[in-house]
Amino acid sequence: QGQDRHMIRMRQLIDIVDQLKNYVNDLVPEFLPAPEDVETNCEWSAFSCFQKAQLKSANTGNNERIINVSIKKLKRKPPSTNAGRRQKHRLTCPSCDSYEKKPPKEFLERFKSLLQKMIHQHLSSRTHGSEDS
């Protein structure tokens, strides 16, 4: 049940990431650690790297408020789960600083890709033999 709540939150975050992608020109063009091709069992560690990244509004134009609200939603801590707790103790996952740094557009694309991977794994895990290739 806790894991379900977590994944439902991930699905909602995809929408927020997609909204932010519309305002990518209004974000500070800073390079941020952006995990890609995350190894199995390091998804939650990579997720926390995305959450910790200093994504910021460039404070220009009329979009500042909506951008800041969206960034705040992205950073909101999800409810704790056993899977998340187990992964926190994995010392083999790369540190956030070790991931390649990318500008906001690629950062958001990689964040979305990780969220999709986590949801897909969750959906597949409760279906016998669902993965076809």
Partner: antibody, heavy 117, light 107 residues
Framework: QVQLQESGPGLVKPSETLSLTCTVS????????WGWIRQPPGKGLEWIGY???????NYNPSLKRRVTISVDTSRNQFSLKLSSVTAADTAVYYC???????????WGQGTLVTVSS | DIQMTQSPSSVSASVGDRVTITCRAS??????LAWYQHKPGKAPKLLIY???SLQSGVPSRFSGSGSGTDFTLTISSLQPEDFATYYC?????????FGGGTKVEIK
């Protein structure tokens, strides 16, 4: 705003292979999941399957033996092949995007495929 | 496979009416439910995902609720453009499955 458009023959003979292509415009196919759903005349919607931009697939077990979904990122297209068709495969076929993996947020308008000799 | 049962199969209503459509899953699906609107010859449109989250650009008169096996789509004040067929879809497990649809007709 992403748009999807199905294309392919509207008439297929029994025992042959149904082939449809979905062209994606206004967005890149190199992210998200891309699926096919069909609706037989007078019936409800049936999920056929989907493919991720990286090529991993999930199919409806009821069709799995006969279905192949593939993606061509260079053309921004993905396609459906359904082999050994019968009259029961007559339906409107929709292609759709699943950004959220669990639901379909953009659809094509659908194309009617009739299986008949 | 998880079976999705919608009721009613059709409903006649007038502009301004409150319309409620229900969807029942054959087993618990948490909040993994989406609602779509479909008009003849048009592309289906996602209205609600994860039971109650409104898809971007969808009017706030549409709302979704429920969890487990019983779900509801409510249109608070029916507009002329809302006459269509509505489908629910579960995403708790593969294969993804749809309800049989509810047609909202003009009274």
């Amino acid at each position: 705003q992403v748009q999807l458009q199905e294309s392919g023959p509207g008439l297929v003979k029994p025992s042959e292979t149904l082939s449809l292509t979905c062209t994606v415009s206004g967005g890149s196919i190199s992210s998200d999941f891309w699926g096919w759903i069909r609706q037989p005349p007078g019936k409800g919607l049936e999920w056929i399957g989907y493919i991720s931009s990286r090529g991993s697939t999930n199919y409806n077990p009821s069709l799995k033996r006969r279905v192949t979904i593939s993606v061509d990122t260079s053309r921004n297209q993905f396609s459906l092949k359904l082999s050994s068709v019968t009259a029961a495969d007559t339906a409107v076929y929709y292609c759709a995007r699943s950004a959220g993996v669990t639901d379909f947020d953009a659809w094509g308008q659908g194309t009617l495929v009739t299986v008949s000799s | 496979d998880i079976q999705m049962t919608q009721s009613p199969s059709s409903v006649s209503a007038s502009v301004g009416d409150r319309v409620t459509i229900t969807c029942r899953a054959s087993q618990g699906i948490s909040s993994w439910l989406a609602w779509y609107q479909h008009k003849p010859g048009k592309a289906p449109k996602l209205l609600i995902y994860v039971a109650s989250s409104l898809q971007s650009g969808v009017p706030s008169r549409f709302s979704g609720s429920g969890s487990g096996t019983d779900f509801t789509l409510t249109i608070s004040s029916l507009q002329p453009e809302d006459f269509a067929t509505y489908y629910c879809q579960q995403a708790n497990s593969f294969p993804l499955t749809f309800g049989g649809g509810t047609k909202v007709e003009i009274k």
